[in-house]
């Protein structure tokens, strides 16, 4: 009798734990990637940023993959995506080529199955960074809730990459899964 | 037979409910703190803001602690942290000491065990608030996903605190737990 | 014996699944609404934006309702709310009547039971958009964690609606439920 109960309870608890693990504790995917400033492209045109840290300082990743400058989704779901991009210039870095700047970020999703790239979120500002001030700074924050499928890739494009702030607290992006797709 | 089933089911359901409570229903920690403008420091240097409401209007807290101007983590986990900081100036408040301003926010984490403070997120902008306009306004938003341990403290530092907008919809910060640490 | 075990396990698993469904899998409410630019009001005063998409492109909704320009809460809970609002102007769109602009967003909550409307979050900036530049752009992002009751309504107000960027990646707002109310 008691042996039967124990065996059955173990079996039932096992399925319970398995279900609970799948439904909640199973390490919901997330990523927080911080800029790797050793390889920031120069220029003022829109470029895709491919160098990010995923395992040092505040950077971390779980149940997602970082490859070739893109954050790859491994698990279908609804995710909250966010990005914080800081631009800065000090006169000691040299004169700006133009005082009128477009400082922009674009968070894009690429689907490999149907080769296409779409902008999920954009933000930024046009700025007049005059020579009258020795230091200039500007930050952009964007965030939103999106359905992502396994294999889809998230990447970050910015204008004027040479002006990016290389600090890990300044220029980063990330995602975390909030819920399953029904 | 039926009694045996009921007893066992109660036992199994009990562990289920206990697990479910721990895993989801157990009041995941959160906080949304709004600025307490009665005690905003003056000056233009970077200062830590210590006066926040936690229990009036939109402000609320659960399974976290607010003490000495810091939001204290009570439960290990991955949290989404955010801050919205608004600065404003009207000519009726008097002339600005300088028209060139750095309006910045820094979200910092302090570990008591290993006494150290680190900036998790920063944002802001340099601004030229000329006397040609009678009113100036600027808001910063930052957000990100971070691993926090019990006992760690989150605080907010800003430049030019005397320019802060004191409304609860303007200047606030918060956190909510998204998932456990594996 | 084995039949008894199967019957009981089915019964226990059934209650488990029911609980799990209620506690986690029960389709947590969310919405991501993108601007419908076919009906943006003109003018420079603060207006409520009533035209949003909820079922095309990135726009989606589940267990919430969109009606009369408002996002209606169907399920009590704590929600993370966010908005991204982009303003832009190109000289081909007409000449600016003033270079001094207040570009603002207000995320408001309306309670029908106690007829009242309150601003949960605000953000924006005063801008000087001079005729010397052919293109101007500025984005605002706000986000925060709020207790919402069934029947409450979320809406978006902006200044200078005629300057809104009509792209779905530019001007949007949303919400997702994070946890139940204790």
């Amino acid at each position: 009798g008691s042996q039967h109960i124990r065996a059955e309870k173990a079996m039932v608890d096992g399925s319970w734990l398995d279900l609970a693990k799948r439904s909640k504790l199973e390490a919901q995917p997330f990523a927080h990637l911080t800029i790797n400033a050793t390889d920031i492209p120069s220029g003022s045109h829109k470029v895709s940023l491919s160098s990010w840290y995923h395992d040092r300082g505040w950077a971390k990743i779980s149940n997602m993959t970082f490859s070739n400058g893109k954050l790859i989704v491994n698990q279908d779901g609804f995710y909250y995506l966010y990005a914080n991009i800081c631009f800065r210039h000090h006169e000691t870095s040299g004169d700006l080529a133009t005082e009128y700047l477009q400082l922009m970020v674009y968070v894009t999703k690429t689907s490999i199955k149907i080769p296409s790239s779409h902008t999920l979120m954009k933000g930024g500002s046009t700025k007049y960074w005059s020579g009258n001030s020795e230091f200039h700074f500007y930050s952009i924050n964007v965030g939103g809730f999106f359905k992502l499928r396994s294999g889809e890739e998230i990447s970050i494009e910015v204008s004027n990459p040479s002006l990016l702030d290389p600090d890990q607290d300044a220029t980063y992006f990330g995602a975390f899964k909030v819920r399953d797709i029904d | 037979g039926s009694q045996h089933i009921r007893a066992e089911k109660a036992m199994v359901d009990g562990s289920w409910l206990d697990l479910a409570k721990r895993s989801k229903l157990e009041a995941q920690p959160f906080a949304h703190l709004t600025i307490n403008a009665t005690d905003i420091p003056s000056g233009s240097h970077k200062v830590s803001l210590s006066s926040w409401y936690h229990d009036r209007g939109w402000a609320k807290i659960s399974n976290m602690t607010f003490s000495n101007g810091k939001l204290i983590v009570n439960q290990d986990g991955f949290y989404y942290l955010y801050a919205n900081i608004c600065f404003r100036h009207h000519e009726t408040s008097g002339d600005l000491a300088t028209e060139y301003l750095q309006l910045m926010v820094y979200v910092t984490k302090t570990s008591i065990k290993i006494p150290s403070s680190h900036t998790l997120m920063k944002g802001g902008s340099t601004k030229y608030w000329s006397g040609n306009s009678e009113f100036h306004f600027y808001s910063i938003n930052v957000g990100g996903f971070f691993k926090l341990r019990s006992g760690e403290e989150i605080s907010i530092e800003v430049s030019n605190p005397s320019l802060l907008d004191p409304d609860q919809d303007a200047t606030y910060f918060g956190a909510f737990k998204v998932r456990d640490i594996d | 014996g084995s039949q008894h075990i199967r019957a009981e396990k089915a019964m226990v698993d059934g209650s488990w699944l029911d609980l799990a469904k209620r506690s986690k899998l029960e389709a947590q409410p969310f919405a991501h609404l993108t601007i419908n630019a076919t009906d943006i009001p003109s003018g420079s005063h603060k207006v409520s934006l009533s035209s949003w998409y909820h079922d095309r492109g990135w726009a989606k909704i589940s267990n919430m309702t969109f009606s009369n320009g408002k996002l209606i809460v169907n399920q009590d809970g704590f929600y993370y709310l966010y908005a991204n609002i982009c303003f832009r102007h190109h000289e081909t769109s007409g000449d600016l009547a003033t270079e001094y602009l207040q570009l603002m967003v207000y995320v408001t909550k309306t309670s029908i039971k106690i007829p009242s409307s309150h601003t949960l979050m605000k953000g924006g900036s005063t801008k000087y958009w001079s005729g010397n530049s052919e293109f101007h752009f500025y984005s605002i992002n706000v986000g925060g964690f709020f207790k919402l009751r069934s029947g409450e309504e979320i809406s978006i107000e902006v200044s200078n609606p005629s300057l809104l960027d009509p792209d779905q990646d530019a001007t949007y707002f949303g919400a997702f439920k994070v946890r139940d109310i204790d």
Epitope: - | - | S42, G43, T98, S162
Partner: antibody, heavy 122, light 108 residues
Framework: EVQLLESGGGLVQPGGSLRLSCAAS????????MSWVRQAPGKGLEWVSG????????YYADSVKGRFTISRDNSKNTLYLQMNSLRAEDTAVYYC???????????????WGQGTLVTVSS | EIVLTQSPGTLSLSPGERATLSCRAS???????LAWYQQKPGQAPRLLIY???SRATGIPDRFSGSGSGTDFTLTISRLEPEDFAVFYC?????????FGQGTKVEIK
């Protein structure tokens, strides 16, 4: 009551210059964008130039760009149009008109002054 | 620039009749950004309608505007003797602001 009164028109030779003025009253002048619109004899209306309330930004039709300059003196509630290198095709009645101030983009014109005639002829 | 073409060039009607004036744009006008003016001989233009369909202050309700995109209409439901004049449409959806060439409404 909003009133706009133009002056400074007259006969001028091709290549010559003229300065038109528009005296405004009945509203907070510095808060509104202003424009000049012209109408050649027996013809339709043509927008010429506009200026923001602060005077910080100015706009011109391609047909007058580089030759005409719009300005304002908010302390005197007066709008100006400096016209240089005048041509025969600039002959018209010149109206000053107020922007409504309810939109961030310059929009319709309301009200208009009574106009001043500029004749460019040798 | 956007070219506005008004039709007909001249409309001959009697008092009490309905007048329908057309304004067609060479490309779609962004938003409701179209206005109508009335000009009588020797006078400055007077604003009648703005934002396609909003009547200006003091304008009688017999004047109404409609349309969107490239096709806009000014309707005078019942002509009064003082209504006979030249009518101009004007767009302000893009720069530069432009006017139509005018429609003359004359007494038949």
């Amino acid at each position: 009551e909003v009133q706009l009164l133009e002056s400074g028109g007259g006969l001028v030779q091709p290549g010559g210059s003229l300065r038109l003025s528009c005296a405004a009253s009945g509203f907070t002048f510095s808060s509104y964008a202003m424009s000049w619109v012209r109408q050649a004899p027996g013809k339709g209306l043509e927008w010429v130039s506009g200026i923001t309330g602060s005077g910080g930004s100015t706009y011109y039709a391609d047909s007058v760009k580089g030759r005409f300059t719009i300005s304002r003196d908010n302390s005197k509630n007066t709008l100006y149009l400096q016209m240089n290198s005048l041509r025969a095709e600039d002959t018209a009645v010149y109206y000053c008109a107020k922007d409504p101030g309810t939109t961030v983009i310059m929009s319709w014109f309301d009200p208009w002054g009574q106009g001043t005639l500029v004749t460019v002829s040798s | 620039e956007i070219v506005l073409t008004q039709s007909p060039g001249t409309l001959s009607l009697s008092p009490g009749e309905r007048a329908t004036l057309s304004c067609r744009a060479s490309q779609a006008i962004r938003g409701p950004n179209l206005a109508w003016y009335q000009q009588k001989p020797g006078q400055a233009p007077r604003l009648l309608i703005y934002d396609t369909s909003s009547r200006a202050t003091g304008i009688p309700d017999r004047f109404s505007g409609s349309g969107s995109g490239t096709d806009f209409t000014l309707t005078i439901s019942r002509l009064e003797p003082e209504d006979f004049a030249v009518f101009y449409c004007q767009q302000y959806g893009s720069s530069p602001r432009t006017f139509g060439q005018g429609t003359k409404v004359e007494i038949k």
